[in-house]
């Protein structure tokens, strides 16, 4: 009796089960009662990453430098090329089809996580006792200066954007 379902890594065609082509190979001809499935390796610029019955291999992704992209990992016959962004840029999506500049954290905010080729800068508000007076993609919130350790007193309180101002102690005390 002809099969109605096939084993793993097989497919049903013309009432018989044929072997799928292994990753890195494309289908040339289906199996018959006399021959196995005929498969051919993908060319150098192509890939197939699953057991398949595709008659064409997929083209490797092109990392377009005009879009700020560069090759992170070269593709093989079984894997696609992985693109990443050039220094100072990060991907706009998970598939990394284009890049945008990293954002800077504004004064009052510090860098919680520095950007990578695939993720943007993560900023956080400077908590009490910390400040940032610059717009930066790298600098964290810095602690206010400790006037006491310098035998000085606070003359002007700090904010999330400014450091404290220290001054000499009042001698009339």
């Amino acid at each position: 009796e002809p099969p109605t379902a096939c084993r793993e890594k097989q497919y049903l065609i013309n009432s018989q089960c044929c072997s799928l082509c292994q990753p890195g190979q494309k289908l040339v001809s289906d199996c018959t009662e006399f021959t196995e499935t005929e498969c051919l390796p993908c060319s150098e610029s192509e890939f197939l990453d699953t057991w398949n019955r595709e008659t064409r291999c997929h083209q490797h992704k092109y990392c377009d430098p005009n879009l700020g992209l560069q090759v992170q990992q070269k593709g093989t016959s079984e894997t696609d090329t992985i693109c990443t962004c050039e220094e100072g840029l990060h991907c706009t999506s998970e598939s990394c089809e284009s890049c945008v500049p990293h954002r800077s954290c504004l004064p009052g905010f510090g860098v919680k996580q520095i950007a990578t080729g695939v993720s943007d800068t993560i900023c956080e508000p400077c908590p009490v006792g910390f400040f940032s007076n610059v717009s930066s993609a790298f600098e964290k919130c810095r602690p206010w200066t400790s006037c006491e350790t310098k035998d000085l007193v606070v003359q002007q309180a700090g904010t999330n954007k400014t450091d404290v101002v220290c001054g000499p102690q009042d001698r009339q005390r």
Epitope: S29, T32, E33, F34, T35, E36, E38
Partner: antibody
Framework: EVKLVESGGGLVKPGASLKLSCAAS????????ISWVRQTSDKRLEWVAS????????YYPDNVKGRFTISRENAKNTLYLQMSSLKSEDTALYYC??????????WGQGTSVTVSS | DIVLTQSPVTLSVTPGDSVSLSCRAS??????LHWYQQKSHESPRLLIK???QSISGIPSRFSGSGSGTDFTLSINSVETEDFGIYFC?????????FGAGTKLELK
């Protein structure tokens, strides 16, 4: 018991035609593809033709394509090979063989074809 | 067409010897290869399928190995009934092709 019995061989002149038969028994004939394979005097084996279980697909090597025709009558459990425009190089012992899991798992005893003037 | 080259052409052995017969394909055929034995005045019979799978009724002294382009048929302790010609056959693509055979004869 699986049995394949070839017949129809003989001595013919170049350019002549000949029809070989293969009678099958001991298995469900209509479930199996069948091939013809020939063996020359130097003992080399050469695939000649194949036909699918239903008879809808046939396969030939280039050197016999257009001259040989494989066919089958499932109701009669019989396989045929119609050979025309025979050449001296077609001289051989012709076997029919059953295709089981893509292997020629059972062979007949062969029938001899001689093409000579 | 895929060409199968068998070696040696002839192998002269004494019963009890263990032997290896080679079959080399002109291009990769994965494990899509069968082995047949043909004794004198008999039809070929299937010995090993898919390069290494045993066949019911065939003595366990026969074994096959290999994948890609290089294949081996091994006979562990040859018996007198093993003399004859051994053929490999590929079923990776059309046309189906056979090797020219290795003749196993008595030394």
């Amino acid at each position: 018991e699986v049995k394949l019995v070839e017949s129809g061989g003989g001595l013919v002149k170049p350019g002549a035609s000949l029809k070989l038969s293969c009678a099958a028994s001991g298995f469900t004939f209509s479930n199996y593809g069948i091939s013809w394979v020939r063996q020359t005097s130097d003992k080399r084996l050469e695939w000649v033709a194949s036909i699918s279980s239903g008879g809808d697909n046939t396969y030939y090597p280039d050197n016999v394509k257009g001259r040989f025709t494989i066919s089958r009558e499932n109701a009669k459990n019989t396989l045929y090979l119609q050979m025309s425009s025979l050449k001296s190089e077609d001289t051989a012992l012709y076997y029919c063989a059953r295709a089981g899991e893509k292997a020629m798992d059972y062979w007949g005893q062969g029938t001899s074809v001689t093409v000579s003037s | 067409d895929i060409v199968l080259t068998q070696s040696p052409v002839t192998l002269s052995v004494t019963p009890g010897d263990s032997v290896s017969l080679s079959c080399r394909a002109s291009q990769t055929i994965n494990n899509n290869l069968h082995w047949y034995q043909q004794k004198s005045h008999e039809s070929p019979r299937l010995l090993i399928k898919y390069a290494s799978q045993s066949i019911s009724g065939i003595p366990s002294r026969f074994s096959g190995s290999g994948s890609g382009t290089d294949f081996t048929l091994s006979i562990n302790s040859v018996e007198t009934e093993d003399f004859g010609i051994y053929f490999c056959q590929q079923f990776s693509s059309w046309p189906l092709t056979f090797g020219a055979g290795t003749k196993l004869e008595l030394k």
